[in-house]
C-alpha cells in the first residue's frame, strides 16, 4: 500500500523555539515515521532538518538549527515505513515574520503602597530578537485579588512602578511584550501575585515641584511630619527605557543631601539640557520612607516657565485680571510657545482662606468680592502637557482694594 504524504503542517515559532506539527494522513497505518528537509532561498539542494528525522509522533522541534531568522526557508515532509510517501511541501516562510514573542519573565517587589515590576525577555540572549531586544515595550493587566477588577497599563518599560495601592493587599498581574517596530504582540506571562507590605511609618514625600529662581532650581515638596531630613536623587529620563544598562544609576544632588527643610536649592548648571526624573526620600534618623513618585523635569521648559505678570482692574464686586507675558531681565517679554493654563489664587487680606481659579484665557474675572475690601492675588503658569506637568513659581502677591458699591458696570 502506498503511504500518503502528511498534511496540514503548522510552524509555530515562539522566541527561539521552532516547533512543527502535522496531521497523519492515514491513521490506520502503524509504525510510521516522519522526516523533514529544508531548503534556503536561492539554493537547489534540500538538507535534512536536524531534530526532525524519523519522528514517530506528529510534532518535532528544530530549535537547534542555526538559521538566519531574516532569510526565507522552505520545508518538506514525508512519511516513511518500508517505503516512503511523496514529499509534501510547506509554504515558504521567514522565521522572523512568523515568530511570536514569548511570555516575559516577571519579578515583583512590594512596598506598602506600590509594586515594582522587573520585566525581562523570556528567552535570554534570544537570536530571534537580537536586533530588537532593546525595543521591547510591555503592557500589563493588574487587579486586586479580592475584587478581580482589571486595570490595563500600556507602553511600559522593563522596570515599572505602580503607585497608589493599598497596604497589606494582594495584587495580581500578567505582562506581555510588544515590538511595535514589527507590529508584534507577545503572549501573556503567567499570573504573578504579591501582597503589599504593612503601611510604612513614614510616608513618602508628595507634590514635588521644580521652579526657577535666579540661576537656581528650587525643588519643593510636601511632608506630613516635622524634624525630618530629606535626600533627592535624579536619573536621565531616557535610561528608563533601558534599566538593565549599567548607566541606570540614581544620582545624588549634592545640595539636596540630608536637607532639613521641605525644599532645596541647587544651581541650574547641575543639569545639562535634557529631561530628568527626580525623586525624594524622607528619614527621621531611624526610619526611612519609600521614595516618592518620580517626577519628570525638562530643563528646557523649566528654565523658561516664568511666573506670569498681570494687571488688576478693580470693581466693587470683582477684579478683572489681565495676564501678560512674563518679563525677563531687561524688561523684555518672554515668548512662551507652548500652551499654558493659569492658576490664580486670591484671598481677603485679613484672612487666610484662599480661593482658586484655573483659566486658559489671559483675561480672567474674579467674582463675588465685597466692596471696599483689600484682596490679594498671585498667579502661576502650568504647561498643559500632562506628562511634563511643569509649573512656574507663583508671582509676587498683588493687593488691591475693591471699589465702593454700585461700580460693577
Amino acid at each position: 500500500k502506498n503511504l500518503k504524504s502528511p498534511q496540514k503542517v503548522e510552524v509555530d515559532i515562539i522566541d527561539d523555539n521552532f516547533i512543527l506539527r502535522w496531521n497523519r494522513s492515514d491513521e490506520s497505518v502503524g509504525n510510521v515515521t516522519f522526516s523533514f528537509d529544508y531548503q534556503k532561498t536561492g539554493m537547489d539542494n534540500w538538507i535534512k532538518l536536524s531534530g526532525c528525522q524519523n519522528i514517530t509522533s506528529t510534532k518535532c522541534n528544530f530549535s537547534s538549527l542555526k538559521l538566519n531568522v531574516y532569510e526565507e526557508i522552505k520545508l518538506r515532509i514525508r512519511a516513511e515505513k518500508e517505503n516512503t510517501s511523496s514529499w509534501y511541501e510547506v509554504d515558504s516562510f521567514t522565521p522572523f515574520r512568523k515568530a511570536q514573542i514569548g511570555p516575559p519573565e516577571v519579578h515583583l517587589e512590594a512596598e506598602d503602597k506600590a509594586i515594582v515590576i522587573h520585566i525581562s525577555p523570556g528567552t535570554k540572549d534570544s537570536v530571534m530578537w537580537a536586533l530588537d531586544g532593546l525595543s521591547f515595550t510591555y503592557s500589563l493587566v493588574i487587579w486586586k485579588n479580592s475584587s478581580g477588577v482589571e486595570e490595563r497599563i500600556e507602553n511600559i518599560y522593563s522596570r515599572h512602578k505602580i503607585y497608589k495601592l493599598s497596604p497589606e493587599t494582594t495584587y495580581c498581574l500578567k505582562v506581555k511584550a510588544a515590538l511595535l517596530t514589527s507590529w508584534k504582540i507577545g503572549v501573556y506571562s503567567p499570573v504573578h501575585c504579591i501582597k503589599t507590605t504593612v503601611e510604612n511609618e513614614l510616608p513618602p514625600p508628595e507634590n514635588i515641584e521644580v521652579s526657577v529662581q535666579n540661576q537656581n532650581y528650587v525643588l519643593k515638596w510636601d511632608y506630613t511630619y516635622a524634624n525630618m531630613t530629606f535626600q533627592v536623587q535624579w536619573l536621565h529620563a531616557f535610561l528608563k527605557r533601558n534599566p538593565g544598562n549599567h548607566l541606570y544609576k540614581w544620582k545624588q544632588i549634592p545640595d539636596c543631601e540630608n536637607v532639613k527643610t521641605t525644599q532645596c536649592v541647587f544651581p541650574q548648571n547641575v543639569f545639562q539640557k535634557g529631561i530628568y526624573l527626580l525623586r525624594v526620600q524622607a528619614s527621621d534618623g531611624n526610619n526611612t520612607s519609600f521614595w516618592s513618585e518620580e517626577i519628570k523635569f525638562d530643563t528646557e521648559i523649566q528654565a523658561f516657565l516664568l511666573p506670569p505678570v498681570f494687571n488688576i482692574r478693580s470693581l466693587s464686586d470683582s477684579f478683572h485680571i489681565y495676564i501678560g507675558a512674563p518679563k525677563q531681565s531687561g524688561n523684555t517679554p518672554v515668548i512662551q510657545d507652548y500652551p499654558l493654563i493659569y492658576e490664580i489664587i486670591f484671598w481677603e487680606n485679613t484672612s487666610n482662606a484662599e480661593r482658586k481659579i484655573i483659566e486658559k484665557k489671559t483675561d480672567v474675572t474674579v467674582p463675588n468680592l465685597k466692596p471696599l475690601t483689600v484682596y490679594c492675588v498671585k498667579a502661576r503658569a502650568h504647561t498643559m502637557d500632562e506628562k511634563l506637568n511643569k509649573s512656574s513659581v507663583f508671582s509676587d502677591a498683588v493687593c488691591e482694594k475693591t471699589k465702593p458699591g454700585n461700580t460693577s458696570k
Partner: antibody, heavy 117, light 107 residues
Framework: EVQLVQSGAEVKKPGESLRISCKGS????????MAWVRQMPGKGLESMGI????????RYSPSFQGHVTISADKSISTAYLQWSSLKASDTAMYYC??????????WGQGTLVTVSS | DIQMTQSPSSLSASLGDRVTITCRAS??????LNWYQQKPGKAPKLLIY???NLASGVPSRFSGSGSGTDFTLTISSLQPEDFATYYC?????????FGQGTKVEIK
C-alpha cells in the same frame, strides 16, 4: 574644572605587586562611573573594567577578570587599579576615564607601567 | 563580550576629503555608541556620544549616525589636525568595549 590626575610612571619586576591611582576633582565623584583602559605599545584601546564609587559596583572585562582589581575610595575621590603579581605582558599605558551617558568624557594623563626583569 | 569591528583598519586621505569610518557591533547596542580620536602620545578624546551627538568643543565637520549594530563616523572635510586614530565604543553592555581602531593617514 573636571580633572583626573593619575599617579606617576612605574617600573616593576615580574611577580611584584602594584597599585596605581586616579584622583577626580571638579565634579561629584560618586555620581560617575570610573573606567580603566589599557593601551599596549602600538596597540588599540582595551576596556579593563569600571567602578561606580557610590556603591562600589564593579564590572570587569572577561579578559581582565581575576588578573586585576579595581577599587575606589570615595572619601578622597580616588579610584585604583592593582595587580598582585605583574607579568611582562602587563607593560602598557593605563588610562582612567570618567564614564557617564556621554561616554568617557574626561581622561587621565595616563600611567606608564613597565614590567621587566 | 560584545565585539566591535571597525573598517577600514587604516586609510589614506587628502586634506578636504570626506572620510567615512564604519563600526559594527556583534549585538544590538541601540544608540549607545561613542567615537573617540587619539593622537600619538595623547589620551583619547571623546568626539561623538550616543551615536550622533557632538561632544563639547568638537568641530561640526564630525558627525555620527546609525543605531542597532551599524554605525558611521563621517569627517566632512578632512583638516590637518584630523590625522589620528579613531575608535568606536559601545556602552550598552558593561563594561564598554572598543573597536580595534582606524588610523587616518595623509595621502
Amino acid at each position: 574644572e573636571v580633572q583626573l590626575v593619575q599617579s606617576g610612571a612605574e617600573v616593576k619586576k615580574p611577580g611584584e605587586s602594584l597599585r596605581i591611582s586616579c584622583k577626580g576633582s571638579g565634579y561629584t565623584f560618586t555620581n560617575y562611573w570610573m573606567a580603566w583602559v589599557r593601551q599596549m605599545p602600538g596597540k588599540g584601546l582595551e576596556s579593563m573594567g569600571i567602578i561606580y564609587p557610590s556603591d562600589s559596583d564593579t564590572r570587569y572585562s572577561p579578559s581582565f577578570q581575576g588578573h586585576v582589581t579595581i577599587s575606589a575610595d570615595k572619601s578622597i575621590s580616588t579610584a585604583y587599579l592593582q595587580w598582585s603579581s605583574l607579568k611582562a605582558s602587563d607593560t602598557a599605558m593605563y588610562y582612567c576615564a570618567r564614564h557617564d551617558v556621554e561616554g568617557y568624557d574626561y581622561w587621565g594623563q595616563g600611567t606608564l607601567v613597565t614590567v621587566s626583569s | 563580550d560584545i565585539q566591535m569591528t571597525q573598517s577600514p583598519s587604516s586609510l589614506s586621505a587628502s586634506l578636504g576629503d570626506r572620510v567615512t569610518i564604519t563600526c559594527r557591533a556583534s549585538q544590538n547596542v541601540g544608540n549607545y555608541l561613542n567615537w573617540y580620536q587619539q593622537k600619538p602620545g595623547k589620551a583619547p578624546k571623546l568626539l561623538i556620544y550616543r551615536a550622533s551627538n557632538l561632544a563639547s568643543g568638537v568641530p561640526s565637520r564630525f558627525s555620527g549616525s546609525g543605531s542597532g549594530t551599524d554605525f558611521t563616523l563621517t569627517i566632512s572635510s578632512l583638516q590637518p589636525e584630523d590625522f589620528a586614530t579613531y575608535y568606536c565604543q559601545q556602552m550598552e553592555h558593561a563594561p564598554p568595549t572598543f573597536g580595534q581602531g582606524t588610523k587616518v593617514e595623509i595621502k
